[in-house]
């Protein structure tokens, strides 16, 4: 027997190796693969090392008993029957308000004679229910909105901000929720003075010139 080669590697159940070359000298790489419906457990790639031993233990082929994660669907939530998607597991998709599901709402993980388990259908889509836009909201006093359009398509978001010295009361971003008709997800916010001093300073008022008003305000504090 030769003493400059690694020992012959056996075939593994439910899989095959490549290349099946006779010369297993150091540096030779052997790759194991599994038949459809099986997955490699362990390292699929073994290399003949300088000391004429294999770099890894022999892998095995294990039956695949679950489906891959079908993924999230934009504008939906999903209900999962089993966390690792074994055969028989279901995933139900429910579209958000203003969106409608196209395709199958419930996917089931099915076993197959040959090959890995497979979902009963592709993941669905959640489409806009309506294209009608929302009418533009006016910017809050002492604030701004972006974008400054008169009509906003269903699904669009507008953002609000306040001038220096003012704070936003309400939602900074609101969405045009598609519907019959489309509508804004929240009322527009308002911009409140951060403090009474800020309120007066922003208007370039000299508080010292209005002693009566300032004393009244002090009393109000």
């Amino acid at each position: 027997p030769r003493n400059d080669t690694c020992p012959e590697l056996p075939e593994i159940p439910n899989g095959w190796k490549s290349p099946s070359q006779p010369e297993l000298v150091h540096g030779t790489v052997v790759t194991y693969q599994c038949y459809p419906g099986y997955q490699v457990v362990g390292s699929s790639v073994l290399m003949c090392q300088w000391d004429l031993t294999w770099s890894e233990d022999l892998p095995s082929c294990q039956r695949v008993t679950s489906c891959h994660d079908p993924g999230d669907v934009e504008h939906s939530r999903r209900l999962i029957s089993s966390p690792k998607f074994p055969v028989g597991a279901t995933v139900q998709y429910i579209c958000d308000q203003g969106f409608v599901l196209m395709g199958s709402s419930i996917l089931t993980c099915h076993d197959r004679q040959a090959g890995s388990p497979k979902w009963s259908d592709r993941a669905p889509k959640c489409l806009l229910e309506q294209l009608k836009p929302c009418h533009g909201l006016s910017a809050p006093e002492n604030g701004a909105r972006s974008p400054e359009k008169q009509l906003h398509p269903a699904g669009a978001t507008i953002h609000f901000s306040c001038a220096p010295g003012y704070v936003l009361k309400g939602q900074a971003s609101i969405k045009c929720v598609p519907g019959h008709p489309s509508h804004w997800s929240d009322p527009p916010p308002i911009c409140r003075a951060a403090s009474l001093d800020g309120f007066y300073n922003s208007r370039s008022l000299d508080v010292a010139k209005a002693p009566a008003a300032s004393s009244t305000l002090d009393a109000a504090h």
Partner: antibody, heavy 118, light 112 residues
Framework: QVTLKESGPGILQPSQTLSLTCSFS??????????VSWIRKTSGKGLEWLAH???????WYNPSLKSRLTISKATSSNQVFLILTSVDTADTATYYC??????????WGQGTTLTVSS | DVVMTQSPLSLPVSLGDQASISCRSS???????????LEWYLQKPGQSPKLLIY???NRFSGVPDRFSGSGSGTDFTLKISRVEAEDLGVYYC?????????FGGGTKLEIK
């Protein structure tokens, strides 16, 4: 206002490849939840849905024609494209693009006619 | 695929009369969300199809109230209460509840 307009070659010979363009305005395919479809009207089968393309570039095809169809989009230029390979006389039809949302075709283009003849 | 069957194929009417078109689906087209996505389109000569009715009975914007839709499950009807000259053309029913979406074969409304 939503408008769509199709353009195509008009006449092809059997086995050639059909390329269609749909140019639209009044909405954006970057709007989440939006889709555009191709539909055709043949004398043999009537109105037949061909393919959808969605805002996220996902593509759905009619199973009966899937192997011959490719749909794509150019979001920034508001265009959707359809390619149909290996055309035959049965593909002689008027081809329409239409908005798809709410599970119906709300707005249609005027259509472009294809005649397949040797 | 869901097969949509329309009747009659041709419907001769006199102007001012009522017209009724039937559409039957090969299976229930009730969507998983409980809605029924049954639509009606009108294609006038030389024009593209136009949406008339969506979700069985809702008129699309700009559609006159002489058009009405009804039905449930697998049987649906489009009624035109007083036919006008501009209503002539081919009417198609359509289901969007199941993939692939499918159209009926069409009903041609013509003058008697």
């Amino acid at each position: 206002q939503v408008t769509l307009k199709e353009s195509g070659p008009g006449i092809l010979q059997p086995s050639q490849t059909l390329s269609l363009t749909c140019s639209f305005s009044g909405f954006s395919l970057s709007t989440s939840g939006m889709g555009v479809s191709w539909i055709r009207k043949t004398s043999g089968k009537g109105l037949e849905w061909l393919a959808h393309i969605f805002w996220d570039d996902d593509k759905w095809y009619n199973p009966s024609l899937k192997s011959r169809l490719t749909i794509s989009k150019a979001t920034s230029s508001n265009q959707v494209f359809l390619i149909l390979t290996s055309v035959d006389t049965a593909d002689t039809a008027t081809y329409y693009c239409a908005t798809f949302y709410g599970l119906y075709f709300a707005y249609w283009g005027q259509g472009t006619t294809l005649t397949v003849s040797s | 695929d869901v097969v949509m069957t329309q009747s009659p194929l041709s419907l001769p009417v006199s102007l001012g009369d009522q017209a009724s078109i039937s559409c039957r689906s090969s299976q229930s087209i009730v969507h998983s969300n409980g809605n029924t996505y049954l639509e009606w389109y009108l294609q006038k000569p030389g024009q593209s199809p136009k949406l008339l009715i969506y979700k069985v009975s809702n008129r699309f914007s700009g559609v006159p109230d002489r058009f009405s839709g009804s039905g449930s499950g697998t049987d649906f009807t489009l009624k035109i209460s007083r036919v006008e000259a501009e209503d002539l053309g081919v009417y198609y029913c359509f289901q969007g509840s199941h993939v692939p979406p499918t159209f009926g074969g069409g009903t041609k409304l013509e003058i008697k």
